[in-house]
């Protein structure tokens, strides 16, 4: 009778084991072990027992002890079970960004690992088990479908293998894949709202605002604003699930014409874009030309208004005849025209909008000086010792200086309150002088003496 010990062994892959082969007869003709494994016999006293060290056990094996005794030949097998954890536990690669509401298939692949009967594959979200299945096939593959939710954002998905050898008196061996961090997002189907001027004047600044609601996570949204080839640099303000991107846009003469304004919102692996056209125009204020801005009374003055070739002008409210970019009027300058404003209003149609520009010039009419009876009476009669204010107003542009002198030496205090004395009596020559000339007027002051009864 041949026996083997141990009859069953579980050992790690590449491990060694001592196997004892025994026989019941005292003087066996043969006693040995049959195995493809590397073996080494340990020397023991006696003939009916042999111990072998079997090494580098890579796979399950059934070494067989045999003996040849006088009463016949017999055999006994030992069962070697090799265990090893999987060489590869991997989640199939997925885009890190996933839209909310999408069915996401998680696929775990497991290569190697034994004994397979004791090997289980577990799919997890964080620590929560989503699916547990025995490892079947090579490579073993376990899949599960997850409906992506907003609260999955930032969640870690992983795959774990469990080699449970506790029934064999060993432990539970776990291997975990690299985690896959899910980034969930919501990008609404509605395009971003773009608010901007439809027309923009050269050498001015405009404000462009791009906004969108219903985004998640809003802080991860990228906003790209551009006018033609010009990238704009917006200031972005975030709400709970919305953003507003505000940018200043400056345009030059090189940008003139129709330009495309784009606002693109990129979130996850999706984008939404809004396009708008902006017409960039050049429209200088009309030019008001006076033959001379300062003229003497009686001078003929031509007032011209010139504007953009496509503009229509009105000069002092009167449209150009024929309607167009030029208007003019002729006048003979009078004192009443001094300070008169000549206003030219130009209108240009740009992309269906009417743009208005104005320019005003003032005419200065030099005239005078003037001294007349109404403003400078020729005769004053005042009672002696009374308080009087001599009034004499000279007119003209520039405003004339006025002096009233008696005998070329005694001034009459114009506009001042004076006590009437005999010295004040006499004829004064009032002279009004300006760059336009000089006029004189005689003013007589009579002083009435008090009557004595």
């Amino acid at each position: 009778q041949t026996s083997v010990s141990p009859s069953k062994v579980i050992l790690p892959r590449g491990g060694s084991v001592l196997v004892t082969c025994s026989t019941s007869c005292d003087q066996p003709k043969l006693l040995g072990i049959e195995t493809p494994l590397p073996k080494k016999e340990l020397l023991l006293p006696g003939n009916n027992r042999k111990v072998y060290e079997l090494s580098n056990v890579q796979e399950d094996s059934q070494p067989m002890c045999y003996s040849n005794c006088p009463d016949g030949q017999s055999t006994a097998k030992t069962f070697l079970t090799v265990y090893w954890t999987p060489e590869r536990v991997e989640l199939a690669p997925l885009p890190s960004w996933q839209p909310v509401g999408k069915n996401l298939t998680l696929r775990c692949q497991v290569e190697g690992g034994a004994p397979r009967a004791n090997l289980t594959v577990v799919l997890l979200r964080g620590e929560k088990e989503l699916k547990r299945e025995p490892a079947v096939g090579e490579p073993a593959e376990v899949t599960t479908t997850v409906l992506v939710r907003r609260d999955h954002h930032g969640a870690n998905f992983s795959c774990r293998t469990e080699l449970d050898l506790r029934p064999q008196g060993l432990e539970l061996f776990e291997n975990t894949s690299a985690p896959y961090q899910l980034q969930t997002f919501v990008l609404p189907a509605t395009p971003p709202q773009l608010v901007s001027p439809r027309v923009l004047e050269v050498d001015t600044q405009g404000t462009v605002v791009c906004s969108l609601d219903g985004l998640f996570p809003v802080s991860e949204a990228q906003v790209h604003l551009a006018l033609g080839d010009q990238r704009l640099n917006p200031t972005v303000t975030y709400g709970n699930d919305s953003f507003s991107a505000k940018a200043s846009v400056s345009v030059t003469a090189e940008d003139e014409g129709t330009q495309r304004l784009t606002c693109a919102v990129i979130l996850g692996n999706q984008s939404q874009e809004t396009l708008q056209t902006v017409t960039i125009y050049s429209f200088p204020a009309p030019n008001v030309i006076l033959t001379k801005p300062e003229v003497s009374e009686g001078t003929e003055v031509t007032v011209k208004c010139e504007a953009h070739p496509r503009a229509k002008v009105t000069l002092n409210g009167v449209p150009a005849q024929p309607l167009g970019p030029r208007a003019q009027l002729l006048l003979k300058a009078t004192p009443e025209d001094n300070g008169r404003s000549f206003s030219c209003s130009a209108t240009l149609e740009v992309a269906g909008q009417l743009i208005h520009k104005n320019q005003t010039r003032e005419l200065r009419v030099l005239y005078g000086p003037r001294l007349d009876e109404r403003d400078c009476p020729g005769n004053w009669t005042w009672p002696e010792n009374s308080q009087q204010t001599p009034m004499c107003q000279a007119w003209g542009n520039p405003l004339p200086e006025l002096k009233c002198l008696k005998d070329g030496t005694f001034p009459l205090p114009i506009g001042e309150s004076v006590t009437v004395t005999r010295d004040l009596e006499g004829t004064y020559l009032c002279r009004a002088r300006s760059t336009q000339g000089e006029v004189t007027r005689k003013v007589t002051v009579n002083v009435l003496s008090p009557r004595y009864e």
């Epitope: 005998d407 001042e416 002279r431």
Partner: antibody, heavy 117, light 110 residues
């Protein structure tokens, strides 16, 4: 327009002296002319004025000591009886009471009178 | 009598500084006050008339003010060329006068 004094010289006390102011570029019938003097190292002193009508007006201290008269183009200042205190530069001035901004009041260069025995 | 009293008799001022000269009339001369600048050996130069009006060619750093009996000449941003004697003159009455001019103020620029 200009004014220029002449006649200033060394005289002995009590010897009458007449200074003449010659004007050009304006009419004495429409402008008053005055006389101002300045003793060496001293301030300006108003003597008197002749109006466009020919009337004369004097400083209180000058009455009786000076006489102002005019022709169509000249104005005279007569020192009736000079004393050593009358040693000064005498200026002829147009319009001392009638000034416009551009009528840079006209002063002559002055003429020096020295009264000494 | 219409006479003028001027103060101070002399004043020292630094370049860039400001100087104020005052004149008082013995009775109201309204706004008929003129100011002159005189440098040694030269005839007086007309600066201001009617109390505050600048004669042509006079820099705006010269400013006249006042009416009635109190008048002021202010020179701001003083320049070395402004060193001179300044006189006020009443230009209201040519009779009843002792002296139509103030006594003068000598302005020395440091």
């Amino acid at each position: 327009q200009s004014v220029e004094e002449s006649g200033g010289r060394l005289v002995t006390p009590g010897t009458p002296l007449t200074l003449t102011c010659t004007v050009s570029g304006f009419s004495l019938s429409s402008h008053a002319m005055g006389w101002v003097r300045q003793a060496p190292g001293k301030g300006l002193q108003y003597i008197g004025i002749i109006g466009s009508s020919g009337s004369t007006y004097y400083a209180s201290w000058a009455k009786g000591r000076f006489t102002i008269s005019k022709t169509s183009t000249t104005v005279d200042l007569r020192l009736t009886s000079p004393t050593t205190e009358d040693t000064a530069t005498y200026f002829c001035v147009r319009d001392p009471y009638d000034s416009f901004g551009d009528a840079y009041r006209l002063w002559g260069p002055g003429t020096l009178v020295t009264v000494s025995s | 009598a219409y006479d003028m009293t001027q103060t101070p008799a002399s004043v020292e001022v630094a370049v860039g500084g400001t100087v104020t000269i005052k004149c008082q009339a013995s009775q109201s001369i309204y706004s008929y006050c003129s100011w002159y600048q005189q440098k040694p050996g030269q005839r007086p130069k007309f600066l201001i008339y009617d109390a505050s009006k600048l004669a042509s060619g006079v820099p705006s750093r010269f400013k006249g003010s006042g009416s009635g009996t109190e008048f002021t000449l202010t020179i701001s941003g003083m320049q070395s060329d402004d060193a001179a004697t300044y006189y006020c003159q009443q230009a209201y009455s040519s009779s009843n006068v002792d002296n139509a001019f103030g006594g003068g103020t000598e302005v020395v620029v440091k």
